[in-house]
């Protein structure tokens, strides 16, 4: 049975700044044919037929739902891309994480400007700080890591705060063992 394709992002962030670039790739097994991929953005068929969809110099209109389809195989699960204009943007490797999987958070500065005194917050409480910009890495996410995250930092000597981001950690499905 052909499996559903999956859309991946490179860089892996689904929240990006206006003007940045991101490549969406439609991954699946046994998809050999060139120009056989359909891309859907907010339900509309895109002109792109390659397995990779390049978004260059992202605009607000690039925000929304992306899905891909190989041949007549089922459509992929949707991936949501959001384009922002702000001083700081909290980016996450995923907004819904399976328990036991890694979670990475990044406090991204507009135009890649240096950000100092970066503090990450979870549910309103300071989680970690450092003098320069830094990432948060949770190697094995647990349900307790679910919450609302944001970051603060200094850009050009002024204090800024990112928009909050909800992270949900879901329990891994238990394998079913059937008695013979």
């Amino acid at each position: 049975v052909p499996q559903k394709p999956k859309v991946s992002l490179n860089p892996p962030w689904n929240r990006i700044f206006k003007g940045e670039n991101v490549t969406l790739t439609c991954n699946g097994n046994n998809f050999f044919e060139v120009s056989s991929t359909k891309w859907f953005h907010n339900g509309s068929l895109s002109e792109e037929t390659n397995s990779s969809l390049n978004i260059v110099n992202a605009k607000f209109e690039d925000s929304g739902e992306y899905k891909c389809q190989h041949q007549q195989v089922n459509e992929s699960e949707p991936v949501y891309l959001e384009v922002f204009s702000d001083w700081l943007l909290l980016q996450a490797s995923a907004e819904v994480v399976m328990e036991g999987q890694p979670l990475f958070l990044r406090c991204h500065g507009w135009r890649n400007w240096d950000v100092y005194k970066v503090i990450y917050y979870k549910d309103g409480e300071a989680l970690k700080y450092w003098y320069e910009n830094h990432n948060i890495s949770i190697t094995n996410a647990t349900v307790e890591d679910s919450g609302t995250y944001y970051c603060t930092g200094k850009v050009w000597q002024l204090d800024y705060e990112s928009e909050p981001l909800n992270i949900t950690v879901i329990k891994a499905p238990r394998e079913k063992y059937w008695l013979q």
Epitope: K128, Y129, E132, G153
Partner: antibody, heavy 120, light 111 residues
Framework: EVQLVQSGAEVKKSGESLKISCKGF????????IGWVRQMPGKGLEWMGI????????RYSPSFQGQVTISADKSISTAYLQWSSLKASDTAMYYC?????????????WGQGTTVTVSS | QSALTQPASVSGSPGQSITISCTGT?????????VSWYQQHPGKAPKLIIY???RRPSEISNRFSASKSGNTASLTISGLQAEDEADYYC???????????FGTGTKVTVL
């Protein structure tokens, strides 16, 4: 009152192991980095390393990397500095100190110091 | 990482002002607005007197002030008093892996 209380003076022989401690009081121990500083007799301050008790993220000075181990037990608000094999040159006063916090740069609360004497 | 350079000693009469310099490079003092200063009396633990280049903890006298220009940071003690006699150390951020490097230390003598 915010304070750091260090373990007592130690007299050891060369080649022995040692673990000294630094316990935090009066604040949320997991929310500030804790640094360790060496001061050899009659000499200046040397930064050894720093740990974030919240997740045990640790950074070492190149001069001390591989020579000592910094750790923390957040359940008892305590940071540690340990040696697996002491040398006579490890004879010094060792201080733990709390980072100001929130990305501000400085060490605002210091322990009273632990004197380590190593004889060869 | 080399220690920051401070004068070995500085002296002044009561009531005078003295300035202690702390010289680094563009990789430490010159590269970041992260400098702190410490006072250490004999047999005592160091005490923070300046953080973030110019900021003073609330309990520290306003006779202590600090600044930075290029690769050099400076600590000024005005209205020098007998209790200011101590060793003074600067510190600067150098990198994410080595956030603290101390100065060589300056002995302040009140004449």
């Amino acid at each position: 009152e915010v304070q750091l209380v260090q373990s007592g003076a130690e007299v050891k022989k060369s080649g022995e192991s040692l673990k000294i401690s630094c316990k935090g009081f009066g604040y949320t121990f997991t929310r500030n980095w804790i640094g360790w500083v060496r001061q050899m007799p009659g000499k200046g301050l040397e930064w050894m390393g720093i740990i974030y008790p919240g997740d045990s993220d640790t950074r070492y000075s190149p001069s001390f990397q591989g020579q000592v181990t910094i750790s923390a037990d957040k359940s008892i608000s305590t940071a540690y500095l340990q040696w697996s094999s002491l040398k006579a040159s490890d004879t010094a006063m060792y201080y733990c100190a709390r980072d100001v916090g929130n990305g501000d740069y400085g060490l605002d609360v210091w322990g009273q110091g632990t004197t380590v004497t190593v004889s060869s | 990482q080399s220690a920051l350079t401070q004068p070995a000693s500085v002296s002044g009469s009561p009531g005078q002002s003295i300035t202690i310099s702390c010289t680094g490079t563009s990789s430490d003092i010159g590269g970041y607005d992260f400098v702190s200063w410490y006072q250490q009396h004999p047999g005592k633990a160091p005490k923070l007197i300046i953080y973030d280049v110019t900021r003073r903890p609330s309990e520290i006298s306003n006779r202590f002030s600090a600044s930075k220009s290029g690769n050099t940071a400076s600590l000024t003690i005005s209205g020098l008093q007998a209790e200011d006699e101590a060793d003074y150390y600067c510190s600067s951020y150098t990198s994410s892996s080595t956030p603290y490097v101390f100065g060589t230390g300056t002995k302040v003598t009140v004449l």
